[in-house]
Amino acid sequence: LPAQVAFTPYAPEPGGTCRLREYYDQTAQMCCSKCPPGQHAKVFCTKTSDTVCDSCEDSTYTQLWNWVPECLSCGSRCSSDQVETQACTREQNRICTCRPGWYCALSKQEGCRLCAQLRKCRPGFGVARPGTETSDVVCKPCAPGTFSNTTSSTDICRPHQICHVVAIPGNASMDAVCTSTSPTRSMAPGAVHLPQPVSTRSQHTQPTPAPSTAPGTSFLLPVGPSPPAEGSTGD
């Protein structure tokens, strides 16, 4: 014979548990219905009546099946260094993440507590490791045959153009300058532009500015803490 289906509220079997999306009410000593996400328990169940649910009010939410008497308050509006990546609805809290050009230096359970600007790489240095939502940019000196003439949180070292006749040799912070015959661009290894980091997804690389006057001397960087940057721009 098919098992009898119990409708809430009902008394569980001795030592038994309530079913999925039900909870045991200590006062009524019955298995009662939980409320769905976006709702809360307006009236708790009794021995003869089931839980009465009601919708969450504006700016409040419940994300799970529940029997809470009040919905949770959504977090405060996102601060100026953050963007809202998930809106406050009756079923989910607002989530704020760091805006492009920033990374999360101190996270919290949902979203970010403190955003910091990504540091930038100066002319003569390129991005070795792009910034992410939770990590800063790492720069490296441009290797021989490559250069970067921008101060940027996204630009890598690019290969010097190859000239038939060189007018001015390139260095770490300046491209080679050719005489009038058309140059070709060398395909040095690692010359591919890094993908935009998550934290700079809406940025774009601006046109390359005039060559910088920064020295092209290469030297090793100490691995240490580093900061952030806003965009990919030249001095």
Epitope: S80, D81, C115, F125, T151, L221, P227, P228
Partner: antibody, heavy 121, light 110 residues
Framework: QSVEESGGRLVTPGTPLTLTCTVS????????INWVRQAPGKGLEWIGI?????ITNFANWAKGRFTISKTSTTVDLKIASPTTEDTATYFC??????????????????WGPGTLVTVSS | ALVMTQTPASVEADVGGTVTINCQAS??????LAWYQQKPGQRPKLLIY???ILTSGVSSRFKGSGSGTEYTLTINGVQCADAATYYC????????????FGGGTEVVVK
Amino acid sequence: QSVEESGGRLVTPGTPLTLTCTVSGFSLSTYDINWVRQAPGKGLEWIGIIYTGGITNFANWAKGRFTISKTSTTVDLKIASPTTEDTATYFCARGGYDSDGYVYPDAFDPWGPGTLVTVSS
Amino acid sequence: ALVMTQTPASVEADVGGTVTINCQASESISNLLAWYQQKPGQRPKLLIYRASILTSGVSSRFKGSGSGTEYTLTINGVQCADAATYYCQHGYTGTNVQNVFGGGTEVVVK
């Protein structure tokens, strides 16, 4: 690379005042600019910042009292309605210290010499 | 709001002695902390950034340390030229901020 403030003077309460920070040797499309003030005999007080993209942010106490805008080589701080409590030396400072191939935007360097604003009736 | 509490407000030191200045953040600031020196009538000068890295040309007698919410500036072998007011500054300009600077510590050299 340097910054210099100008526009400080004696004004009566309620008279709007605009201070200007003129930068040289670097681009405002690469570095942020902060405004900081110091009342006579008091400590440094951060007012606000204009980021490279033109977005501004202010200290909680300064919101609505100041605005910051920029051109290609200058950054203006406007005090909407000065009170005697706004009497101070006003500094602009670049957000970004250059070191070891990096620009560290969380440190302020260089600073201008400051410009004195006196608000008195 | 993120608040920086700097102590002491004033400290006296003998030439050759050691001075310790403390800065406490109301929550972790992940080493995004700088120290400045300001002498009367002058603009502030950046001494240390990222909690412990000395800027170019600053004497190694200055040392920054700390992490999380607690940071310290130590001046060893104090000299007369060190008489100044010192400020800590957190590096978060985009958050709920009252003031990025601590209240300052005046160092008087005897």
